[in-house]
Amino acid sequence: VTCDDYYYGFGCNKFCRPRDDFFGHYACDQNGNKTCMEGWMGPECNRAICRQGCSPKHGSCKLPGDCRCQYGWQGLYCDKCIPHPGCVHGICNEPWQCLCETNWGGQLCDKDLNYCGTHQPCLNGGTCSNTGPDKYQCSCPEGYSGPNCEI
């Protein structure tokens, strides 16, 4: 039995006609099975295969090789969270967090907890003590005075 165009199988009861549109992106093999075009997958070949490495959790694509990030995620593979806007010396594990690096504090990690170490403000051999975020105190050697032992 010779089947009409696009019909396959015993009894010609299988249909496959190549298409490349909203409904699918496929060719047909000699048995009438859909063979997805490069970059497409799924039963109807209408699901794009995303960029290799694209986060399956935070990235997706509608075109092959693409990787579109969910809100709150960034990077080539959508695997990097976006920290809280204005976060200075902090990182995130989840979107919009601002987890401070060592010696930094405050909501935006912009408060120096180690002002002494960062700025070394005490002059003339004065001893520096961190007293709070962005705060310090200098103990001046004999003969010197002022906030930074500068006098």
Epitope: D4, Y6, Y7, C12, F15, R17, D21, F22, F23, G24, G42, P43, E44, N46, R47, K62
Partner: antibody, heavy 116, light 107 residues
Framework: QVQLVQSGAELKKPGASVKVSCKVS????????IHWVRQAPGQGLEWMGI????????KYAQKFQGRVTMTVDTSTSTAYMELSSLRSEDTAVYYC?????????WGQGTLVTVSS | DIQMTQSPSSLSASVGDRVTITCRTS??????LTWYQQKPGKAPKLLIY???ILDSGVPSRFSGSGSGTDFTLTISSLQPEDFATYYC?????????FGGGTKLEIK
């Protein structure tokens, strides 16, 4: 087995909106598109649109453009069809159906009556 | 949009008769045509898809033919349960329009 179960009948006033749900079971929801078809009393079948359940992309018949919104919730395997600015001519049974090569599976239908 | 012209719109026939319903499209749809049967108060039932492939469980007295723009649904020997309304529908491109229907009644 494959099942499409629709929400119950609705009575709406002209100008209102209606949202019909279609919960599917028996197959992977995102493998098949969902279509919506309606049938006014004593009339024929009218195709309204299709939604790609994987991406959530939809395409509508020109007649319903701007008034219909089709959405999906993949977490509950449910498709939704919302029709706004209802008028008496929208009184019909609304069906969801599954398919690419014709509709082998249909919901039981939801009667939407628009009356003041 | 592709227009679907289904004829006749109604038809009276007797049990055992051979019945033919036709569907013509305004442009080439290859074999992207489906036939449905609908009984009052029920959802349509798929009979034939891709113009000539019988859906599983559909009796062999139903057959479909045609491609391009002209299609036919044939019931070789009418049975009492076949009295219903029949619709064609194309699924070539959006929108997937339906024919107007053919109401098959007992003579």
């Amino acid at each position: 087995q494959v099942q499409l179960v629709q929400s119950g009948a609705e009575l709406k006033k002209p100008g209102a909106s209606v949202k019909v749900s279609c919960k599917v079971s028996g197959y992977a929801f995102t493998d098949y598109a969902i279509h919506w078809v309606r049938q006014a009393p004593g009339q024929g079948l009218e195709w309204m649109g299709i939604i790609n359940t994987y991406y959530g992309d939809s395409k509508y018949a020109q007649k319903f453009q701007g008034r219909v919104t089709m959405t999906v919730d993949t977490s509950t395997s449910t498709a939704y069809m919302e029709l706004s600015s209802l008028r008496s001519e929208d009184t019909a049974v609304y069906y969801c159906a599954r398919g690419y090569d014709g509709f082998a599976y249909w919901g039981q239908g939801t009667l939407v009556t628009v009356s003041s | 949009d592709i227009q679907m012209t289904q004829s006749p719109s109604s038809l009276s026939a007797s049990v055992g008769d051979r019945v033919t319903i036709t569907c013509r499209t305004s442009e080439n749809i290859y074999s992207y045509l489906t036939w449905y049967q609908q009984k009052p108060g029920k959802a349509p039932k798929l009979l034939i898809y891709h113009a000539k492939i019988l859906d599983s469980g559909v009796p062999s007295r139903f057959s479909g033919s045609g491609s391009g723009t002209d299609f036919t649904l044939t019931i070789s020997s009418l049975q009492p349960e076949d009295f219903a309304t029949y619709y064609c529908q194309h699924h070539y491109d959006i929108p997937w329009t339906f024919g107007g229907g053919t109401k098959l009644e007992i003579k």
